[in-house]
């Protein structure tokens, strides 16, 4: 391991489709990858009126926007589909929502994931 | 082993649309995004978009912005890439590559657009 | 965003080494370590040699080395061997916040 670098083994692994994908509900998800490669974890979720529903957890893939990340944060104003990915174990069982706005000021909306 | 494998030849008109897909295995499908990228006949690489394959977030190049639609079906681990208004200059192979790094490729699909 | 700039092509003998450069700006190429270098044979699908400006990718010979000074990245084969000849290309990191450009691609013949 890198010093001052936090490698990621295992993320919160969700997916609110799991009977039509066939897969876990809930659980740990063990992260391969090229043994070179950095690993992730990352959380997908939906803010239907107010309403957090999250779609999916789990690893995810050697990515620079992840890079050195502890907390999992989407900056991205009002998307779709909320994501964000982080570094080090489990870092995806919280998220937050950090939108980066170009003239005011940004608004925090700290979530915490409870799983239906 | 990780595998992504795309559509056939296809052979359009002028005007028209294709639709190309890559088939992902091997791997979990949404883990990753999806790129495509062109080689014209003779010509070098040209990146047209990706596709985030768990958030269905996509990013284009400009020059293709509103002539190309990237998707991705997760249910079947399938991507997809919609070129409309084709062109004779559209005529390429076409290929899909997994993650940022395009660390695996598929055997590209043939796009031929004739009048 | 603009293609990067490769030569049009190099070329060397069975064992000499060469060098391929790739100049983007300080924007892309200069800010972050995030160029990669692609081998494509003919009638191929390009093949990804060297990922961050200077990671070997799994399997690849140690032969072939990345590396960057300012805003040119460059790789280097040393050793040449016949079934080094190839179109090589330069490109950048793909998703999220980033998008893709790729070098116009440099031919390398093995004389």
């Known amino acids: 391991a890198i010093l001052g670098r936090s490698e990621t083994q295992e993320c919160l692994f969700f997916n609110a489709n799991w009977e039509k994908d066939r897969t876990n509900q809930t659980g740990v998800e063990p992260c391969y990858g090229d043994k070179d490669k950095r690993r992730h974890c990352f959380a997908t979720w939906k803010n239907i009126s107010g309403s957090i529903e999250i779609v999916k957890q789990g690893c995810w893939l050697d990515d620079i926007n992840c890079y050195d990340r502890t907390d999992c944060v989407e900056k991205k104003d009002s998307p779709e589909v909320y994501f964000c990915c982080c570094e080090g174990n489990m870092c995806n069982e919280k998220f937050s929502y950090f939108p980066e706005m170009e003239v005011t000021q940004p608004t925090s909306n700290p979530v915490t994931p409870k799983p239906p | 082993q990780v595998q992504l494998v795309q559509s056939g030849a296809e052979v359009k008109k002028p005007g028209s649309s294709v639709k190309v897909s890559c088939k992902a295995s091997?791997?979990?499908?949404?883990?990753?995004?999806i790129n495509w990228v062109r080689q014209a006949p003779g010509q070098g690489l040209e990146w047209m978009g990706t596709i985030n394959a768990v958030s269905g977030s996509t990013s284009y190049a400009q020059k293709f912005q509103g002539r190309v639609t990237i998707t991705a079906d997760t249910s079947t681990s399938t991507a997809y890439m919609e070129l409309s208004s084709l062109r004779s200059e559209d005529t390429a192979v076409y290929y899909c590559?997994?993650?940022?790094?395009?660390?695996?490729w598929g055997q590209g699909t043939l796009v031929t657009v004739s009048s | 965003q603009s293609a990067l700039t490769q030569p049009r092509s190099v070329s060397g003998s069975p064992g000499q080494s060469v060098t391929i450069s790739c100049t983007g700006t300080?924007?892309?190429?200069?800010?972050?370590?995030?160029v990669n270098w692609y081998q494509q044979h003919p009638g191929k699908a390009p093949k990804l040699m060297i990922y961050?400006?200077?990671k070997r990718e799994s399997g690849v010979p140690d032969r072939f080395s990345g590396s960057k000074s300012g805003n040119t990245a460059s790789l280097t084969i040393s050793g040449l061997q016949a079934e080094d000849e190839a179109d090589y290309y330069c490109?950048?990191?793909?998703?999220?916040?980033?998008?893709?450009?790729f070098g116009g691609g440099t031919k390398l013949t093995v004389l």
């Open positions: 490109g950048t990191f793909a998703g999220g916040d980033y998008y893709g450009v």
């Open positions: 590559a997994r993650g940022g790094w395009f660390d695996y």
């Open positions: 961050g400006v200077s």
């Open positions: 091997g791997y979990t499908f949404t883990s990753s995004y």
């Open positions: 300080s924007s892309d190429v200069g800010s972050r370590n995030y």
